[in-house]
């Protein structure tokens, strides 16, 4: 089948990094500078992506593969193939229409990107707040209030009943 296809379409013999040049009797010509073809049998080469402005080159374009971009320091990639660069904020902030804004009380963001998320509601799991939340950190939930009855340790859980010979350290 491949041989038949080759006889029918001489362009199928053109490897990646070349294109089938109709102007030159369908011979395989190398991709011109700043262009590439990642598969064989191409009739044109694609223009290389240019990483400009806020984008910087992560991988140079070659005759067989496109350039890859990432973002300059202070920005991070968004979208497939880093199609956008978004400004970082500080931890404890989120990027809004008016710029980087501190997380509202009751919310936090522990990254330089993304949105502020609500603190965990410990009581929903029947637990108490062990460490209060901040703009940068979620609350830390501790044992349930019932576990904190006098004599009970808030750090070491009681030994499992099925291990009668074991006692807490």
């Amino acid at each position: 089948f491949e041989r038949t296809r080759s006889l029918q379409d001489p362009c199928s013999n053109c490897p990646a990094g070349t294109f089938c040049d109709n102007n030159r009797n369908q011979i395989c010509s190398p991709c011109p500078p700043n262009s590439f073809s990642s598969a064989g049998g191409q009739r044109t080469c694609d223009i290389c992506r240019q990483c400009k402005g806020v984008f910087r080159t992560r991988k140079e374009c070659s005759s067989t593969s496109n350039a890859e971009c990432d973002c300059t320091p202070g920005f991070h990639c968004l979208g497939a193939g880093c199609s956008m660069c978004e400004q970082d904020c500080k931890q404890g902030q989120e990027l809004t229409k008016k710029g980087c804004k501190d997380c509202c009380f009751g919310t936090f963001n522990d990254q330089k990107r993304g949105i502020c998320r609500p603190w965990t509601n410990c009581s929903l799991d029947g637990k108490s707040v062990l460490v209060n939340g901040t703009k940068e950190r979620d609350v830390v939930c501790g044992p349930s209030p019932a576990d904190l009855s006098p004599g009970a340790s808030s750090v070491t859980p009681p030994a499992p009943a099925r291990e009668p010979g074991h006692s807490p350290q």
Epitope: K52, G53, F75, C85, Q87, L95
Partner: nanobody, 122 residues
Framework: EVQLVESGGGLVQPGGSLRLSCAAS????????MSWARQAPGKGLEWVSG???????YYTESVKDRFTISRDNAKNTLYLQMNSLRPEDTAVYYC????????????????WGQGTLVTVSS
């Protein structure tokens, strides 16, 4: 071919003023959102200001009340009026199209100028 050419940079004393211009060609300027960015020596790029085609303006916190972005669609020119300049405003200032319309976000299809240097020093 899209071209953005900045001008108006220079040396200015703290507290002084400068007006940067960005002459645009090769695209429909009047319907394009535009932005300014800057890069201080040895630091990363920073989003400074943006203006929608309709005229709505946006600024990063550190330049609010000191910088004013504006546009003249008849002249295909973007401006940045910078008042009360501080040493920390020293940077190369870039003009760029702003297709995302999102604060602090540029896309790969946006176009950039070569930049103009602003130095604030006594």
């Amino acid at each position: 071919e899209v071209q953005l050419v900045e001008s108006g940079g220079g040396l200015v004393q703290p507290g002084g003023s400068l007006r940067l211009s960005c002459a645009a060609s090769g695209f429909t300027f009047s319907s394009s959102a535009m932005s300014w960015a800057r890069q201080a020596p040895g630091k990363g790029l920073e989003w400074v200001s943006g203006i929608y085609s309709g005229g709505s303006t946006y600024y990063t916190e550190s330049v609010k009340d000191r910088f004013t972005i504006s546009r003249d669609n008849a002249k295909n020119t973007l401006y940045l009026q910078m008042n009360s300049l501080r040493p920390e405003d020293t940077a190369v200032y870039y003009c760029a199209t702003w297709g995302t319309l999102r604060f602090g976000v540029w896309a790969e299809y946006d176009h950039w100028g070569q930049g103009t240097l602003v130095t604030v020093s006594s």
